[in-house]
Amino acid sequence: EVEKTACPSGKKAREIDESLIFYKKWELEACVDAALLATQMDRVNAIPFTYEQLDVLKHKLDELYPQGYPESVIQHLGYLFLKMSPEDIRKWNVTSLETLKALLEVNKGHEMSPQVATLIDRFVKGRGQLDKDTLDTLTAFYPGYLCSLSPEELSSVPPSSIWAVRPQDLDTCDPRQLDVLYPKARLAFQNMNGSEYFVKIQSFLGGAPTEDLKALSQQNVSMDLATFMKLRTDAVLPLTVAEVQKLLGPHVEGLKAEERHRPVRDWILRQRQDDLDTLGLGLQG
């Protein structure tokens, strides 16, 4: 906490400029008007303030806006955002995607911090759902964002937003998350033709039930082993040897390399040896 001291004569700041970097902390506190700072926040990032000086500027804004900063200030926080705590951010009402982008840019290249997580949470809750533009933005900055959401949070994602999801965005999703996302993807892509549909739905198939896998096996999709390995065990077990052969097409030979791994191992165990022998891969049930 900076002590309240009178501003020395001639030092009162008329605008936010580089001369302020020579001010001591107490001088910044005494000589910079909080309202001036708020209106000229966009200039702060162009000035090489020390961390200590930024602390003073934050303190001034906190005094001016005890109930939380207005969006006009938030949008121009820049590196001052890194000084904010999750508690500070919970007081904000961020509605503009441009504001969100500006703040995410500050944290770019770093892992998602508690501050960023809180900011995103506030933004998404404010919007009521995770719309396509928001999802586009968030996954661009954090490819793993979608998989950081709980199944309950994912349930608010409208099917239309699924078009924004790239395969790499689902890399770290667990089965419970894919269980929620798969029906949305199925709905989003339902009007596509066979081969195009499979390309789009492939990344989501970790949430697919047996019936859908059986249907896909009738469409010559040639599923690769990497996708097959991500399928739900309970969805794979009821598939017949013939259905798996059709589903994988030329990739069926890859089962041999995965015979000790789930879900392939579980599936093999539950097949008749005579049926497995038809594959000619030497799989032992």
Epitope: D174, P175, M229, K230, D234, R260, R262, R270
Partner: antibody
Framework: QVQLQESGPGLVKPSETLSLTCTVS??????????WSWIRQPPGKGLEWIGY???????NYNPSLKSRVTISVDTSKNQFSLKLSSVTAADTAVYYC???????????WGQGTMVTVSS | DIQMTQSPSSLSASVGDRVTITCRAS??????LNWYQQKPGKAPKLLIY???SLQSGVPSRFSGSGSGTDFTLTISSLQPEDFATYYC?????????FGGGTKVEIK
């Protein structure tokens, strides 16, 4: 609900064969989703999986124990058994039988039986 | 074989504390990771399966996360009955392996 109970001698001499049986009650050893495992825990140490059997008779063993282990199943008695040959003091442990549900994990365990290898 | 490395091997905590235990696989195991709790003289009990799914009857203060090689078990608010040893286990590869265990003791 399904319960498991281990039985067998608590003392085995070095170089002999350890034999244990697990009796399944309240359910069938022929369950589609279940495999039946043996897991052991030496005193004061961690858990070591020994192997499993499916009701069809298919088995899978821990590679480090494979040469000494045989697991069998008797569907008529609703039991499965473990034989571990050429035992040494290093095989002294609490031996557990457990059900593994293919969709979850080792969800049901016996209470364990202490087997000491000593002359 | 896939090696499972748990850390820490032991920890001291107080009732009400948030406790985090990590488990690392020597190669990717997708989401095939289970967590067990074992109390002295008792058989282990399944807490979490498939990395993040809560086994029926297990309190919601237990949660799991992770995929690939890095996994976490979290107890949001430690209760007196939670002082025990926790093991991770991979059922992905046929040579099922357990982590070395993490003993959670009273501070």
């Amino acid at each position: 609900q399904v319960q498991l109970q281990e039985s067998g001698p608590g003392l085995v001499k070095p170089s002999e064969t350890l034999s244990l049986t697990c009796t399944v009650s309240g359910g069938s050893v022929s369950s589609y989703y279940s495999t039946w495992s043996w897991i052991r825990q030496p005193p004061g140490k961690g858990l070591e999986w020994i192997g499993y059997i499916y009701y069809s008779g298919s088995t899978n063993y821990n590679p480090s124990l494979k040469s000494r282990v045989t697991i069998s199943v008797d569907t008529s008695k609703n039991q499965f058994s473990l034989k571990l040959s050429s035992v040494t003091a290093a095989d002294t442990a609490v031996y557990y039988c457990a059900r593994e549900d293919a969709l979850t994990g080792f969800d049901i365990w016996g209470q364990g039986t202490m087997v000491t290898v000593s002359s | 074989d896939i090696q499972m490395t748990q850390s820490p091997s032991s920890l001291s905590a107080s009732v009400g504390d948030r406790v985090t235990i990590t488990c690392r696989a020597s190669q990717s195991i997708s989401s095939y990771l289970n967590w067990y709790q074992q109390k002295p003289g008792k058989a282990p009990k399944l807490l979490i399966y498939a990395a993040s799914s809560l086994q029926s009857g297990v309190p919601s203060r237990f949660s799991g996360s992770g995929s690939g090689t890095d996994f976490t078990l979290t107890i949001s608010s430690l209760q007196p009955e939670d002082f025990a040893t926790y093991y991770c286990q991979q059922p992905y590869d046929a040579s099922y392996t357990f982590g070395g265990g993490t003993k959670v003791e009273i501070k």
